[in-house]
């Protein structure tokens, strides 16, 4: 399902458009030079930080247009069979538990945003990542313990939710169920990863709204 060539290309952020433009400019100036990507990314990031809102506006417009394109294409996109399971997301299903880092971010995001009101979501995330990396293992432990507890609770809740929500499963053959169990778990792991990304996107969107208020 992941490699469907007909699937619309993912939407690009304003920063991604900026990096793309940087790359094109670099290619024009140095057509034969090989690019040191970490150095190139660093330079792009530094340049982006110093850019005014007006300069960034062009790339934000490109991102908005691309978002509209993506949403338009997704409306008409029909995923291959077996991929439709993603469409319905039960609001009553237990919510995926946050990771230790996610819990840490919830603690310190207000401080970072409050001390640097002009920072973009990406830069806030970067600062939080730096904070987490610099946090001693001993100070990370409580977050890891809490995340583990929440994960344990989630696993119990999801097991109960699945048992309650699939009464027709009992009718199907036990052998068949066992066979498909491993495959199902793999799919769910994939789905969980996607869910987490979606949750983070949702939070970023909320933050964007917060930023507008500030």
């Amino acid at each position: 399902g992941k490699g469907d060539p007909k699937k619309p290309r993912g939407k690009m952020s304003s920063y991604a458009f900026f990096v793309q433009t940087c790359r094109e400019e670099h290619k024009k100036k140095h057509p034969d030079a090989s690019v040191n990507f970490s150095e190139f990314s660093k330079k792009c990031s530094e340049r982006w930080k110093t850019m005014s809102a007006k300069e960034k506006g062009k790339f934000e417009d490109m991102a908005k247009a691309d978002k509209a394109r993506y949403e338009r294409e997704m409306k008409t996109y029909i995923p291959p069979k077996g991929e439709t399971k993603k469409k319905f997301k039960d609001p009553n299903a237990p919510k995926r538990p946050p990771s230790a880092f996610f819990l840490f971010c919830s603690e310190y995001r207000p401080k970072i945003k409050g001390e640097h009101p002009g920072l973009s979501i990406g830069d806030v995330a970067k600062k939080l990542g730096e904070m987490w990396n610099n946090t001693a293992a001993d100070d990370k432990q409580p977050y890891e313990k809490k995340a583990a507890k929440l994960k344990e609770k989630y696993e119990k809740d999801i097991a109960a939710y699945r048992a309650k929500g699939k009464p027709d499963a009992a009718k199907k053959g036990v052998v068949k169920a066992e066979k498909s169990k491993k495959k199902k778990e793999e799919e769910e792991d994939e789905e969980d990863e996607e869910d987490e990304e979606e949750e983070e996107d949702e939070e970023d969107e909320e933050e964007e709204e917060d930023d507008d208020d500030e």
Partner: antibody, heavy 121, light 111 residues
Framework: EVQLLESGGGLVQPGGSLRLSCAAS????????MVWVRQAPGKGLEWVSS????????IYADSVKGRFTISRDNSKNTLYLQMNSLRAEDTAVYYC??????????????WGQGTLVTVSS | DIQMTQSPLSLPVTPGEPASISCRSS???????????LDWYLQRPGQSPQLLIY???NRASGVPDRFSGSGSGTDFTLKISRVEAEDVGVYYC????????FGQGTKVEIK
């Protein structure tokens, strides 16, 4: 100006209880991790307990685990330390301090003036 | 637990002269990020402690530049280039890599 003002200290019998408060002002209290540190008469400093900004995670020194409870009320800009089953060795000046996270590297940048707790019969 | 050992425990000083306090930890305080998780505090007589140095060598705001911190791993030093009368008190080192532990303190007094 950052200010931390402890209160609630006093004389208590062994096995008794006491609740210390630390009123914070001059900064956004809800952004900061906070700690309690104590100092027995004529002795050195000992870290007692820490609490994260939301109050959702608390950490204790082994010497007070199970007896002391740290908490906070961000709406009142106040930090608390509930001390139960007090022992003579808990006699000390109790300081609250703010934890500054310099990109994750912690240090105690502001301290209160302290409140004296005496456990004696 | 990480043990912190300071020396000397008492340091008589002469105003205008330099002074030096040593702090040793039972385990390395050097984090993978290259920073040492060690701070220095001063407690003046009858006062609460105040931060002098954080992360081994960074002077806290408002701290005079005669104070400097150095060292890495398990051996650290706090130096006062020219002691002044207001520098008297007890100096503590504190590690924040594993929980929090302070050294026993070094009492600095004028000769």
């Amino acid at each position: 100006e950052v200010q931390l003002l402890e209160s609630g200290g006093g004389l208590v019998q062994p096995g008794g209880s006491l609740r210390l408060s630390c009123a914070a002002s001059g900064f956004t209290f809800s952004w900061y991790k906070m700690v309690w540190v104590r100092q027995a008469p004529g002795k050195g400093l000992e870290w007692v307990s820490s609490i994260v900004p939301s109050g959702g995670i608390t950490i204790y020194a082994d010497s007070v685990k199970g007896r002391f409870t740290i908490s906070r009320d961000n709406s009142k800009n106040t930090l608390y330390l509930q001390m139960n089953s007090l022992r003579a060795e808990d006699t000390a000046v109790y300081y609250c301090a703010r934890v500054q996270q310099w990109l994750g590297r912690p240090y105690f940048d502001y301290w209160g003036q302290g409140t004296l707790v005496t456990v004696s019969s | 637990d990480i043990q912190m050992t300071q020396s000397p425990l008492s340091l008589p000083v002469t105003p205008g002269e330099p002074a030096s306090i040593s702090c040793r930890s039972s385990q390395s305080l050097l984090h993978g990020n290259g920073y040492n998780y060690l701070d220095w505090y001063l407690q003046r007589p009858g006062q609460s402690p105040q931060l002098l140095i954080y992360s081994g060598s960074n002077r806290a705001s408002g701290v005079p530049d005669r104070f400097s911190g150095s060292g890495s791993g398990t051996d650290f030093t706090l130096k006062i280039s020219r002691v002044e009368a207001e520098d008297v008190g007890v100096y503590y080192c504190m590690q924040s890599l594993q929980s929090r532990t302070f050294g026993q303190g070094t009492k600095v007094e004028i000769k």
